[in-house]
């Protein structure tokens, strides 16, 4: 597997009439300028938005904000000293902070959760540390789409 | 300077073949129709080159500006593939092309690799240990 | 080029006030983090405050904390220090200073300063 | 908070000396480490980001290494104009703190 000797040849890119995941037989693809990693699909912004703006700008691409699996999962990354925003928010409803799927935050990913702000969004840097900061604020953003 | 995003949410963005295709390594992240190791661990240029090698893959090289920020933003500097065998020489990449893009500290004789540092090339010791990346077209 | 520049310090008395403005130019003032770091009289660095984009996110140091309040103007590209009850250890160099493009909390500008002198 | 180390808090050099700073952090900061340089009446100037990423414009004599809790930073060949207080600084996590500082004096 680590090997690139028996690569097929294949045309770099392929067409499509829209950004829906382009699957076949055996492949799956990410869009142009999006980044590859462990079966999933990233978009790395560098323009800096607000948490709302970048939920929707994901949203239009057929993307959510970063949900996070575990904190190695930017592993690609982890020398990044950027934050970004990711899809976590305060649930007043269910007094919990929810991933945009609706799937509650784990209490192992970020230890220092119970600090953060309720009325806050969370802003990620893939080195592990998370910051709670008003969504009004603008920050990069990660988009994601899992692929499988 | 953040690169330019208008064109990125086009309703017909092309697609790339993306790692778990089964085109590039494990752990190796796809971009732009090219596979890249990201690494961790510090080498000099020649030994980033040869641990490359041994990868089946070449040292990191830039295409292109859009590339050159991308990989920019993710990683702080990273050895590429362009040496010039004293001050006297010229640039060239590890094919043996000419090397036209311009490379800061150029008039120092003692730097003679490059390194990619936040969108911009300069020039380093070939001997100090930096973290280098590999890249492999598809 | 990015230029930072001060003003509002000058002598005042324990307890007085002084306003600190900067002026920002150069650069997206909005998409930047702005900080207040100061310096006494031979001595070290010290952060002092920090104020996020749109200004919804402060940090003060604990030893200016109730006393001083940083705001920031995105429109008019100024950053702000309020300083009230002055005491004789807020004696210093006051600098303004803007984040590095790559590195968040690293300071990769920085203004000329303005002191500040608290004395009776 | 984190403590940040800085040693020795003074140096005396020579021209083309090669000189090195450390900066010991009470906790691990993984690379989140800046080095400045202040001269007598001015601002602080970015020398190092990131551990070991030069600042542009800032000249390669000038080189940090380090990660976690131990950094240094060499000048290979000391310029006349490299005569000034040095400051290590962490990033990592609030309250952002300095090191003590490490004055570099002419022999």
């Known amino acids: 597997k680590n090997s690139f000797t028996k690569l097929s040849i294949e045309p770099a890119f392929t067409p499509g009439p829209n950004i829906e995941l382009q699957k076949d037989s055996d492949c799956c693809s990410c869009q142009e300028k999006w980044v590859g990693y462990r079966c999933n699909c990233y978009f790395i912004s560098s323009e800096q938005k607000t948490w709302n703006e970048s939920r929707h700008l994901c949203a239009s691409q057929k993307s959510s904000l970063l949900q996070l699996q575990n904190t190695d999962e930017l592993d690609f990354m982890s020398s990044s000293q950027q934050f970004y925003w990711i899809g976590l928010s305060y649930s007043e409803e269910h007094t919990a902070w929810l991933w945009e799927n609706g799937s509650a935050l784990s209490q192992y990913l970020f230890p220092s959760f119970e600090t953060f702000n309720t009325k806050n969004c969370i802003a990620y840097n893939p080195n592990g540390n998370a910051l709670d900061e008003s969504c009004e604020d603008k920050n990069r953003y990660i988009c994601k789409q899992q692929l499988i | 300077i953040p690169f330019l995003e208008q064109n990125n949410f086009s309703p017909n963005t092309r697609t790339q073949k993306a790692r778990h295709c089964g085109h590039c390594p494990e752990e190796w992240i796809t971009y732009s129709n090219s596979c890249y190791y990201i690494g961790k661990e510090r080498r000099t240029w020649e030994e980033s080159l040869l641990a490359c090698t041994s990868k089946n893959s070449s040292l990191l090289s830039i295409d292109n500006e859009e590339e050159m920020k991308f990989l920019a933003s993710i990683l702080p500097s990273s050895w590429i593939g362009v040496f010039r065998n004293s001050s006297h020489h010229p640039w060239v990449t590890i094919n043996g092309l000419a090397f036209k893009h311009k490379i800061k500290d150029s008039d120092n004789a003692e730097l003679n690799c490059a390194v990619l540092q936040v969108n911009r090339l300069k020039s380093a010791q070939c001997g100090s240990s930096m973290i280098y990346h590999c890249k492999h077209k598809l | 080029q990015v230029q930072l520049v001060e003003s509002g310090g000058g002598l005042v008395k324990p307890g007085g006030s002084l306003r600190l403005s900067c002026a920002a130019s150069g650069f997206t003032f909005s998409d930047y983090y702005m900080r207040w770091i100061r310096q006494a009289p031979g001595k070290g660095l010290e952060w002092v405050s920090h104020?996020?984009?749109?200004?919804?996110?402060?940090y003060y140091a604990d030893s200016v904390k109730g006393r001083f309040t940083i705001s920031r103007d995105n429109a008019k590209n100024s950053l702000y220090l309020q300083m009230n009850s002055l005491r004789a250890e807020d004696t210093a160099v006051y600098y303004c200073a803007r984040d590095h493009y790559y590195s968040r909390g690293v300071i990769g500008y920085w203004g000329q300063g303005t002191l500040v002198t608290v004395s009776s | 908070d984190i403590q940040m180390t800085q040693s020795p808090s003074s140096v005396s050099a020579s021209v083309g000396d090669r000189v090195t700073i450390t900066c010991r952090a009470s906790?691990?900061?993984?690379?989140?480490l800046a080095w400045y340089q202040q001269k007598p009446g001015k601002a602080p100037k970015l020398l190092i980001y990131a551990a070991s990423s030069l600042q542009s414009g800032v000249p390669s004599r000038f080189s940090g290494s380090g990660s976690g809790t131990d950094f240094t930073l060499t000048i290979s060949s000391l310029q006349p104009e490299d005569f000034a207080t040095y400051y290590c600084q962490q990033a990592n996590s609030f309250p952002y703190t300095f090191g003590q500082g490490t004055k570099l004096e002419i022999k």
């Open positions: 906790q691990g900061i993984s690379s989140w």
């Open positions: 104020i996020s984009t749109s200004g919804s996110t402060i």
